[in-house]
């Protein structure tokens, strides 16, 4: 919509708004140690932080959601911080015939927005 | 991942988990009355509700986010309910030369998932 403009500056202060953050997790944390061999530890980029009015709005739906949340906060939730894109990750895992490589397209976030 | 299975039954009770809900909004609510002519009122389908562990997980990222939220709730947020697809909406709006129709592909949610 030409009449609602998403913004990129965080009104809540540094690091408070929707952004990418790296979380370290082991295969044990993920419950994957029985089938994934490597890497043993993953640097998982995830989307965290708040989505104040018009901040990094994903699309028109997110813009109107933000607006309606301001009018009906009990009825309409604020937009929330979710991945806008992903970076592929290759895992080495056990198979019936030995070891195999597989690429996961939707495991590690590359960018975030408010949806 | 073959080892984390998203689920479709809500453990919190009917209507509590992530689902599509219709919110009625006027052009005035949206701040669009100066440029949109019709419809005067919109039935906006939006995604609302909670995302308990493994419920309607959007993808592998959402599954591991749910898992890590269980382990590090202060560090990793729970997945949240966002549109998985949209349904197009045609709006009639003012232009410099008169009236025009425009289709918005990302205004009204059609399905929801936890991301």
């Amino acid at each position: 919509s030409a009449h609602l403009h998403p913004r990129d500056s965080c009104p809540l202060g540094p690091g408070r708004c929707c952004h990418l953050e790296t979380v370290q997790a082991t295969l044990e944390d993920l419950g994957w140690s029985d089938w994934v061999l490597s890497p043993r530890q993953l640097q998982l980029s995830m989307c965290v932080g708040e989505c104040p009015h018009l901040y990094r709005s994903a699309n028109t739906h997110a813009l109107i959601k933000a607006r309606l949340h301001g009018l009906q906060p009990d009825r309409v939730p604020a937009p929330c911080c979710v991945p806008s894109s992903y970076t592929p990750v290759v895992l080495m895992h056990r198979t019936d015939s030995g070891v195999s490589l597989q690429t996961y397209d939707d495991l590690v976030a590359q960018g975030c927005h408010c949806a | 991942s073959a080892h984390l299975h998203p689920r479709d039954s809500c453990p919190l009770g009917p209507g509590r988990c992530c689902h599509l809900e219709t919110v009625q909004a006027t052009l005035e609510d949206l701040g669009w009355s100066d440029w949109v002519l019709s419809p005067r009122q919109l039935q906006l389908s939006m995604c609302v509700g909670e995302c308990p562990h493994l419920y309607r997980s959007a993808n592998t990222h959402a599954l591991i986010k749910a898992r890590l939220h269980g382990l590090q709730p202060d560090r990793v947020p729970a997945p949240c309910c966002v549109p998985s697809s949209y349904t197009p909406v045609v709006l009639m709006h003012r232009t410099d030369s008169g009236v025009s129709l425009q289709t918005y592909d990302d205004l009204v949610a059609q399905g929801c998932h936890c991301a």
Epitope: L37, S38, P39, R40, Q43, T87, P88, V89, V90, L91, M92, V99, S100, L101, Q102, T103, D105, V108 | -
Partner: antibody, heavy 119, light 107 residues
Framework: EVQLVQSGAEVKKPGESLKISCKGS????????ISWVRQMPGKGLEWMGI????????IYSPSFQGQVTISADKSISTAYLQWSSLKASDTAMYYC????????????WGQGTLVTVSS | DIQMTQSPSSLSASVGDRVTITCRAS??????LNWYQQKPGKAPKLLIY???NLQSGVPSRFSGSGSGTDFTLTISSLQPEDFATYYC?????????FGQGTKVEIK
Amino acid sequence: EVQLVQSGAEVKKPGESLKISCKGSGYSFTDYWISWVRQMPGKGLEWMGIIDPSGSYTIYSPSFQGQVTISADKSISTAYLQWSSLKASDTAMYYCARVSYYGGYFDIWGQGTLVTVSS
Amino acid sequence: DIQMTQSPSSLSASVGDRVTITCRASQSISNNLNWYQQKPGKAPKLLIYAASNLQSGVPSRFSGSGSGTDFTLTISSLQPEDFATYYCFQLDHSPFTFGQGTKVEIK
């Protein structure tokens, strides 16, 4: 500086054994996998296989399974490619490459080792 | 195994030309495709990863697109240093495979 340095060119006879090396420096060797790639004279690139130096897990392309052995010694940050019995058709340039499993690409390459097998 | 077919196998172009190289996978590989450039006597160099992401330090005249089975590498304005052989590479699942290469020569 992050780099992979490969051992020098080799001239061998058919039936002989050979082990070429690829030494990583400037980064934590066990944090990245190493792949080997073959390029026969005037030809394209062929993926041979991969090793996780931290656990020495290896995966081979079916074309190279049983023909070569990929190994690593993490104590000296070195990966190896070896043959027990060379053939004339093994004549090629062999490259090692560091694998970034985030993004899934070969980000650092060795300079290549030319292996010539001739009677 | 997934077969990667590049076209053309070679092309002649002039400095300033827009060059497009295509790569087709024998089955869907999502966006799990890289592009490498190789000059004679040198090791390959990564240009594009995940189908469309430009590797750090690579000039912006290089771009990649596509998903599924069909992919494209575009050089918007060919420079003298771009005359080389270009390879696509799939890493959707093992065994990983390269395309046969496209040689870009001076017209």
